[in-house]
Interface confidence: low
């Protein structure tokens, strides 16, 4: 048993059959020493009497807010929440499993430049009695600090029958250098509770492997006299890191047709323009990636060509 | 080109042959962006390799001032890379594609390292650790780890020249 | 009493797909994870996948890649394994084991032949 | 996946002698937590598997007291102090360290 917060404990259960749970031993947090009952949830029931109660935690039931009284009066409050070990793994019960980039992937992160900012987010099905709460850090055994806002709802999706819900959150490494080569991953916690249920998720990254650029900005179309080719410019987005000369992007630029069977047209460039030909009903889209590193392409700004 | 005594180095050159770095070493092992190496065992093998960290002068600012110290650390690095790539966790078994850019990765980082070193100037280099892993496995795992590595550090590096060239060109 | 009773044996041909239940009472279905498992005729008991029943989260034995298919029906307390495509080397009896593995049930042969 | 080798592959027993039943596992069970996460289990002909032991060591509801089970994180073993003519069967190990949990051959125990 371990205390998650004032007053809040979680017991971790070995989900096993006829396993004998953990002894908990809960005390009242008060001077006085006679006279005290105890009581679980809303139920009248008294358990026990004394400063403390001790109880064998073994599944749901026996998880709550217990409560220790005298003459009428609440004298303290302890929440016992569980955390399932079933089969030798911890349960993931309350997180969707997102599977990308690979399995098991509850959390997502991203940031759009090298500021040391970042956006974490997470599905579930669960719409009610449900809270999270975010850690992070840099490096684990001797941690820098991460400074990480309040997790909230940020998406709601129906997904065949059912819901699904995306919270996120933004977290800012309080001493970021963005110049510097990472040697120490990002480590961000989260830990949800769902009703008695407790669990906790873990993403372990770097900075420069979640960067995803936003899509380049005042993309236009300047037609070039006496030709069907056209000069597609563009700028850096206002978010991406600066100086420019330093922190780099390239770019990929698409003529794709109306048809999604139609050949696109790719062209990849350092510039911030390029010459393309321009078919009847066309699109030019443009997208940017760090230079350097291959992290992920920002989503396409696109311009028709009519 | 930099040496010791503070001349400026052959920026666009360095500009040209860091970025080729960048792409040889993601065309050596694209993939490895999809593997989440930090869960495999063997942290200390690569936890010596040299980092651009912080302090080293390599953000703009610092690249103004002094671009000495800077040039240093990525020599530095350069040629503890350009080491651990002809190493016997590159030349051993398993053998490597005929075709694979290790090699040409190899000769970039020396090419560099001498532009930046030119003979008869030394700077202090790492020692390169002894890394002479007990099975082909784990020489695999370690390339790719060497190599994940090695695209974070030219990836600063080739930040550098490319700013050095826009702004501290002759 | 805990109980888990699986539905009956089936025939199939080569290609076909195959649906076995597993209806649980006894307890509360949607506390306790459920484990497929499988038995061909002399061979070693080889474990297919687990649903939890509450949140109809699955973990996959990779060997099925993509022919094993685990579903709940909470309302009804069962547990649904699918297995498409199959080969004469399906034949066996297929188990669903409650979370830990303490209560099985009866089995479902399932044979596959032209 | 962990491989789980299981010796001997039969196992001929007088009644009121004991039996040992081994297990190997191609990695370590034994996690930080102090628990070997280790099943052993008797198939009896006919009948679907019942569970004996569970975590290396601890037995099942209802399992008579003359199993035991222990081990290392590595090797494993299923004893039965004294064999009664009910405990004819196969036996198995199963590791849920990891998935896939796998499952040992079996070792089949007869009576003399």
């Known amino acids: 048993i371990w205390e998650l917060k004032k007053d809040v404990y979680v017991v971790e259960l070995d989900w096993y059959p006829d396993a004998p749970g953990e002894m908990v031993v809960l005390t009242c947090d008060t001077p006085e020493e006679d006279g005290i009952t105890w009581t679980l949830d809303q139920s009248s029931e008294v358990l026990g009497s004394g400063k403390t109660l001790t109880i064998q935690v073994k599944e749901f039931g026996d998880a709550g807010q217990y409560t220790c009284h005298k003459g009428g009066e609440v004298l303290s409050h302890s929440l016992l929440l569980l955390h399932k070990k079933e089969d030798g793994i911890w349960s993931t019960d309350i997180l969707k499993d997102q599977k990308e980039p690979k399995n098991k992937t509850f959390l997502r992160c991203e940031a759009k430049n090298y500021s040391g900012r970042f956006t974490c987010w997470w599905l579930t099905t669960i719409s009610t009695d449900l809270t999270f709460s975010v850690k992070s850090s840099r490096g684990s055994s001797d941690p820098q600090g991460v400074t990480c806002g309040a997790a909230t709802l940020s998406a709601e999706r129906v997904r065949g029958d059912n819901k699904e819900y995306e919270y996120s959150v933004e977290c800012q490494e309080d001493s970021a250098c963005p110049a510097a080569e990472e040697s120490l991953p990002i480590e961000v916690m989260v830990d949800a509770v769902h009703k008695l249920k407790y669990e906790n998720y873990t993403s372990s990254f770097f900075i420069r492997d979640i960067i995803k650029p936003d899509p380049p900005k005042n993309l236009q179309l300047k037609p070039l006299k006496n030709s069907r080719q056209v000069e597609v410019s563009w700028e850096y987005p206002d978010t991406w890191s600066t100086p420019h000369s330093y922190f780099s992007l390239t770019f990929c630029v698409q003529v794709q047709g109306k048809s999604k069977r139609e050949k696109k047209d790719r062209v990849f460039t350092d510039k911030t323009s390029a010459t393309v030909i321009c078919r009847k009903n066309a699109s030019i889209s443009v997208r940017a990636q760090d230079r350097y590193y291959s992290s992920s392409w920002s989503e396409w700004a696109s311009v028709p060509c009519s | 080109r930099a040496v010791p005594g503070g001349s400026s180095p052959a920026w666009t050159q360095c500009q040209q042959l860091s970025q080729k770095l960048c792409t040889l070493a993601w065309s050596a092992h694209p993939l490895v962006g999809h593997m989440d190496l930090r869960e495999e065992g063997d942290e200390e093998t690569t936890n010596d390799v040299p980092h651009i960290q912080c302090g080293d002068g390599c953000d703009p600012q610092g690249l103004r001032d002094n671009s000495q110290f800077c040039l240093q650390r990525i020599h530095q690095g350069l040629i503890f890379y350009e080491k651990l790539l002809g190493s016997d966790i590159f030349t051993g078994e398993p053998s490597l594609l005929p075709d694979s850019p290790v090699g040409q990765l190899h000769a970039s980082l020396l090419g560099l390292s001498q532009l930046l070193q030119p003979e008869g100037h030394h700077w202090e280099t790492q020692q390169i650790p002894s890394l002479s892993p007990s099975q082909p496995w784990q020489r695999l795992l370690l390339r790719f780890k060497i190599l994940r590595s090695l695209q974070a550090f030219v990836a600063v590096a080739a930040r550098v020249f490319a700013h050095g060239a826009a702004t501290l060109s002759p | 009493e805990v109980q888990l009773v699986q539905s009956g044996a089936e025939v199939k041909k080569p290609g076909a797909s195959v649906k076995v239940s597993c209806k649980a009472s006894?307890?509360?279905?949607?506390?306790?994870?459920m484990n497929w498992v499988r038995q061909a005729p002399g061979q070693r008991l080889e474990w297919m996948g687990v649903?939890?029943?509450?949140?109809?989260?699955?973990t996959y034995n990779q060997k099925f890649k993509g022919r094993v298919t685990i579903t709940v029906d909470t309302s009804a307390s069962t547990a649904y394994m699918e297995l498409s495509s199959l080969r004469s080397e399906d034949t066996a009896v297929y188990y669903c084991?409650?979370?830990?593995?303490?209560?099985w049930g009866q089995g479902t042969l399932v044979t596959v032949s032209s | 996946d962990i491989v789980m080798t299981q010796t001997p592959l039969s196992l001929p027993v007088t009644p009121g002698e004991p039996a040992s039943i081994s297990c190997r596992s191609s990695k370590s069970l034994l996690y930080k937590d102090g628990k070997t996460y280790l099943n052993w289990f008797l198939q009896k002909p006919g009948q679907s598997p019942q569970l004996l032991i569970y975590l290396m060591q601890t037995r099942a509801s209802g399992v008579p007291d003359r199993f035991s089970g222990s081990g290392s994180g590595t090797d494993l073993t299923l004893k039965i102090s004294r064999v009664e003519a009910e405990d004819v069967g196969v036996y198995y190990c199963?590791?849920?360290?990891?998935?896939?949990?796998?499952f040992g051959s079996g070792t089949k125990l007869e009576i003399k």
């Open positions: 006894g307890y509360s279905f949607t506390d306790h994870n």
């Open positions: 199963q590791q849920i360290a990891e998935y896939p949990f796998t």
């Open positions: 649903i939890n029943p509450n949140y109809g989260t699955t």
């Open positions: 084991a409650r979370r830990g593995f303490a209560y």
